[in-house]
């Protein structure tokens, strides 16, 4: 097979017969040495599936439940072109599964038992795979066969395809279960007239299910949707309450040796050459053959999907919950409103070892996940592999563009017994240099810097933001001469004073001797010119308090702060000198697990938090000799967020914004994925 | 500082017993927490078993009901009794007290623990 062939699956003869259409069309718009189609026909998509796990076939366009299947081991394959629908500045490749109920009902998502309820049709993602599958926990036992669960669940129905005879309580709204639009109740907009009928009481749906069947706002007004925490919201707010996200169609590759590059460059060149209205003679989104022919025909174009995204990423933690409950039919055997244990995800083997020391004394409440980035672990958590780490305001952001929210401040200022309740203010980012240098904020250029990390909020986003709106460009790495930034790219100038050693050079962990806050001032005590931190970095490093050979000689008065205004001030003065105030750091989980983890870090806190004083024979939460593993060394308790429960709110508007500008010099994988 | 010193390991057949020692330098009374690691070859060093001053215990899942930690704090002392061993028991093991030296990577020499037939 040559290098620069795509092998696509056909699973029809209809499909085998468009996709030799598209070989031959493609071949006459591509250059000889551009990428070409093949075509294998197999009986079946999952047939396709196993044919290019087994590169006997490079891609082939999927259903999400078939994604699921692709994913699945021994298959391992990935998305890496999305179909999109609407139009080419507002594309849509998600759609979302929501449940809507009438407003004036007052009941939430955990007490659907005996009502009645209206589906779009039996075996169908948004009505009913998605809802079902969420709750197939609550359902009645057995829970098989399920229809008879769901029967003995919902106090009536109407799922239109299911069989009547069987199961009358499923047909009690829609008599018969009709499986096409003579059922009144049928499909989407059947299952929504279900419900304005008064026939049902919550219908399963897409998002846009409501705004096509009501064109009036007020008319819409009349409806709220579910959310799966047990409140409800306008049905404008789909994106922040709904049961999953659900892709639409989607292009799979092999995770390893996939051909992505070159799939996507033949794709992208197929919809310039033969997209929406391009050509006659051929058309990607249509065939005489039949319909939805290898693509769909109500697919408008393809986008590349993120290289960070994986299929669990992509399907998202409710998807395969839904999809993985209804396959597996596996239910945890503790109730589901009793908290299991916390997995906290741990950056690398150093706080991997603080992490296993805190579960083994907290009897198991908390259990420990490892992962190489700060990113890794928040993908982590998306997917449930992990349940909640601490974070820095920067990687708050970002974990808050990835649907986690804040659920507790690490408080550095206040002390006990008030800190559990107090909102603190944040402490400074700052600028330290050496007291015997002439360097000021104005005079940077060309010098020798030292951050935390790429997207921590001292160490990069606030200096890096101050500085982006002075030079205008993302460039940073030809600003400054040379520095450490670990989680740059690892032949730019940014990694070339990091001290590693050599395979963790640069990398945003503590196996890098130059990450964190002791890493950066270190690096400014060894090699740097300047060094972003907290306000609160040199006087912890000073005065013999870090015993490491590195600093036990440091003094505080050798280190001054930058200010802004050009001038220069002792380290006693970051109230009076400093970049700007940082939010403190916060504790991020799914909204699905937030109250557990708040309830159960409030209750580890009293036995392991700042009220031991000795922790030379003790576990302390909040010590690590410097090392700021897992949580700042200098907490004094993870305080209640009260209302600031959203990222934007903990953070505040005016470092969003300041975020959001940097966004254009993002190297995030995953904030990229995040916002697809 | 207690050093500490780990012993007991050898080669054993898949199904065996063996069990490890690691002797402190100093009491271990004052020492809240100890465990067992251990690194495979060309893996990272993981979680065997722990162990607090309390008698909590904690397990990695893959040797759950084989092994059995315990600590004996008048002989300053901690132990790994490992039961129907497997050739991916196969590895180094390490003893660790947590303190902060192991932030540092300052680890023992460990024992070699190989399962072979």
């Known amino acids: 097979v040559p290098e620069k062939s795509v092998r696509w699956c056909a699973v029809s003869e209809h499909e085998a017969t468009k996709c030799q259409s598209f070989r031959d069309h493609m071949k006459s718009v591509l250059p000889s040495n551009g990428p070409s189609v093949a075509c294998v026909k197999k009986a079946s998509h999952l047939d396709c599936i196993r044919a290019i796990a087994a590169n006997e076939a490079d891609a082939v366009t999927l259903d999400a439940g078939l994604v699921y299947d692709a994913y699945l081991a021994p298959n391992n394959l990935k998305p890496v072109v999305a179909e999109f629908y609407g139009s080419k500045e507002d594309p849509q490749t998600f759609y979302y599964a929501v449940a809507v109920v009438k407003k004036d009902s007052d009941f939430q998502m955990n007490q659907l038992r005996g009502r009645k309820s209206c589906h779009t049709g039996l075996g169908r993602s948004a009505g009913w795979n998605i809802p079902i599958g969420l709750l197939y926990c609550d359902l009645p036992e057995p829970r098989k066969p399920l229809e008879k669960a769901v029967a003995n669940f919902f106090s009536g129905s109407c799922v239109p395809c299911a069989d009547g005879t069987d199961f009358p309580q499923l047909c009690q709204l829609c008599p018969g279960c009709g499986c096409s639009t003579l059922n009144q109740y049928f499909s989407y907009s059947g299952a929504f007239k279900c419900l304005k009928d008064g026939a049902g009481d919550v219908a399963f749906v897409k998002h846009s299910t409501i705004f096509e069947n009501l064109a009036n706002k007020a008319d819409r007004d009349q409806y709220e949707l579910l959310c799966l925490d047990n409140t409800r919201k306008s049905v404008d707010e789909y994106k922040d309450c709904h049961l999953a996200r659900v892709p639409s169609h989607t292009v799979v590759a092999r995770s390893v040796g996939g051909k992505e590059d070159l799939i996507w460059e033949l794709l992208n060149q197929a919809q310039e050459h033969f997209g929406k209205d391009k050509s006659k003679e051929f058309q990607l989104f249509s065939s005489p053959h039949g319909k939805d022919l290898l693509f769909k025909d109500s697919a408008h174009g393809f986008l590349k999907v993120p290289p960070r995204m994986d299929a669990k990423m992509y399907l998202g933690y409710e998807y395969i919950t839904a999809i993985r409950n209804l396959r597996e039919g596996t239910c945890p055997e503790a109730p589901t409103d009793e908290c299991k244990p916390v997995k906290w995800c741990a950056l690398s083997h150093h706080e991997r070892l603080k992490c296993d020391e805190w579960s083994v004394n907290s009897a198991g409440k908390i259990e420990c996940e490892s992962a190489e980035t700060t990113e890794d672990c928040i993908a982590k958590i998306m997917n449930g592999e992990a349940d909640a780490m601490s974070l820095d305001g920067g990687f708050v952001y970002i974990a808050g563009m990835c649907g986690l929210v804040p659920v507790l401040a690490e408080n550095y200022n206040t002390p006990n017994p008030n800190c559990e309740n107090t909102a603190e203010e944040g402490y400074f980012a700052v600028a330290v240099v050496k007291s015997s240098s002439d360097l000021t904020w104005d005079n940077l250029k060309g010098k020798k810097s030292c951050h935390t990390a790429v997207g921590r909020t001292a160490g990069w986003n606030i200096p890096m933001g101050l500085l982006y709106s002075k030079i205008n460009h993302c460039r940073f790495d030809e600003f400054f001469s040379e520095g450490c930034a670990p989680g740059s790219e690892k032949n730019s100038s940014l990694c070339k004073l990091c001290m590693g050693p050599s395979p963790n050079l640069c990398e945003p962990n503590n196996k890098e001797g130059y990450y964190g806050y002791t890493g950066a001032f270190r690096c400014l005590v060894e090699k740097g010119d300047v060094a972003f931190v907290k306000h609160q970095t040199v006087p912890q490093n000073t005065g013999g308090k870090n015993p490491d050979a590195w600093a036990k000689n440091l003094k505080e008065e050798d280190y001054e702060l930058l200010c802004l205004d050009g001038s220069r001030k002792s380290v006693q003065e970051p109230a009076n000198c400093h970049l700007a105030r940082a939010p403190n750091h916060a504790v991020v989980a799914r909204k699905d697990k937030a109250d557990c983890v708040q309830t159960l870090l409030l209750d580890q806190q009293r036995m392991f938090g700042s009220s031991v004083t000795d922790c030379s024979s003790n576990f302390c939460l909040f010590e690590s000799k410097t090392k700021d593993l897992l949580f700042r060394d200098d907490t004094v308790c993870l305080a209640k967020l009260h209302d600031r429960n959203t990222y934007e709110k903990y953070l505040g508007e005016e470092y969003v914004k300041a975020v959001t500008n940097l966004r254009k010099c993002s190297t995030s994988p995953l904030l990229e994925a995040c916002t697809f | 500082q207690v050093q500490l010193v780990e012993s007991g390991g050898g080669l054993v057949q898949p199904g065996g017993s063996l069990r490890l020692s690691c002797a402190a330098s100093?009491?271990?009374?004052?020492?809240?927490?100890m465990g067992w690691y251990r690194q495979r070859p060309g893996k990272q060093r993981e979680l065997v078993a722990a162990i607090t001053r309390g008698g909590n215990t904690n397990y990695a899942d893959s040797v759950k009901g084989r092994f059995s930690i315990s600590r004996d704090n008048a002989k300053n002392t901690m132990y790994l009794q490992m039961n129907s061993l497997k050739p991916e028991d196969t590895a180094v093991y390490y003893c660790?007290?947590?303190?902060?030296?192991?932030?540092?990577?300052?680890w023992g020499q460990g024992t070699q623990v190989t399962v072979s037939s």
């Open positions: 660790t007290d947590y303190s902060r030296r192991y932030y540092q990577d300052d």
């Open positions: 100093g009491s271990i009374f004052s020492i809240n927490t």
